[in-house]
């Protein structure tokens, strides 16, 4: 009889432990849900405010056709410039045409005058070929005018209305580029 009672007591204790575990899991699940809900709400608010301001480019960016451009107000070396653009969901400027080059240089003249601005162009150390950041080659009319006399890595920059080259470790302004948002109207 005593053995039977102690078995029942042990079973009850086991059941209690399981219920406590379930309650703990539920509390954790509820907390996780609340957290997800908070993220969801923040995401929704972000999306709504973006939709409300449905401008094709973010604030302080310049639009030309399907592209948005950001002209930095800080100096950095080429690699840091690249990372700064990535933080904004963009890449260093890749100039596809003479028309785009003219737009950029015209805009720079209006904004800041004759400074140096890193673009997404770099020279392969082995072959000496100039390549954009996506691996494509620049069109013949968009090659840096002068070959930099540097043993270090060489990168491309825009100054006035020219594409030039320089040691990637020098400090310059930079230009980021991303696609403009299509209007859904």
């Amino acid at each position: 009889k005593l053995l039977q009672v102690s078995t029942i007591a042990m079973q009850q204790q086991e059941k209690l432990i399981q219920q406590e575990r379930a309650l703990l899991n539920f509390t954790e699940w509820k907390r996780s849900c609340a957290l997800q809900m908070k993220y969801c709400q923040a995401f929704m608010q972000n999306s709504l405010s973006s939709a409300h301001n449905s401008s094709p480019c973010p604030n302080n960016w310049i639009q030309n056709r399907e592209s948005c451009y950001y002209v930095s107000e800080i100096w950095s070396i080429w690699h840091t410039s690249q990372e700064n653009c990535l933080k904004e969901g963009s890449t260093l400027l890749q100039i596809e045409s003479k028309e785009e080059m003219d737009f950029i240089t015209g805009s720079l003249r209006k904004i800041k005058g004759s400074y140096d601005y890193w673009v997404g162009l770099s020279q392969d150390g082995h072959s000496g070929r100039w390549l954009w950041q996506d691996g494509s080659s620049p069109s013949p009319g968009l090659l840096p005018a002068e070959r930099s006399q540097s043993a270090n890595q060489v990168c491309g920059y825009v100054k006035s209305n020219s594409l030039l080259s320089s040691n990637c470790s020098t400090w310059k302004y930079f230009i980021c580029e991303k696609y403009a948002l299509r209007s859904s109207v």
């Epitope: 923040a42 933080k87 904004e88 969901g89 890449t91 950041q133 996506d134």
Partner: nanobody, 115 residues
Framework: DVQLVESGGGLVQPGGSLRLSCAAS????????MGWYRQAPGKQRELVAA???????TYADSVKGRFTISRDNSKNTVYLQMNSLRPEDTAVYYC?????????WGQGTLVTVSS
């Protein structure tokens, strides 16, 4: 926060291929771009490749034409397809999430290219 888990590293012969994966979770809506960095023993960590949310890629000169970065938004995963691997590609490869505020790093996955 954003959590990143890398996989796919290993030992491969020169000329071989590997595909690294980086799965993101957490506050992924704050991420504007994802990238792969690598660090070889005694060297600085360097950017290998990155891809923006709009799908624009960027590559280091040393991997252009050999490595391809891609993303699967439905799985919140970024991939690095590495072809024609060379001994100098040996390093720990880290995944990074770029946000306007903090940057988030994975734990890293070791890639060894050796015969």
């Amino acid at each position: 926060d954003v959590q990143l888990v890398e996989s796919g590293g290993g030992l491969v012969q020169p000329g071989g291929s590997l595909r690294l994966s980086c799965a993101a979770s957490g506050r992924i809506f704050s991420v504007n771009a994802m990238g792969w960095y690598r660090q070889a023993p005694g060297k600085q960590r360097e950017l290998v490749a990155a891809i923006t949310n709009q799908g624009a890629p960027t590559y280091a000169d040393s991997v252009k034409g050999r490595f391809t970065i891609s993303r699967d938004n439905s799985k919140n995963t970024v991939y690095l397809q590495m072809n024609s691997l060379r001994p100098e590609d040996t390093a720990v490869y880290y995944c990074k999430a770029f946000t306007r505020g903090d940057d988030y790093w994975g734990q890293g996955t070791l890639v060894t290219v050796s015969s």
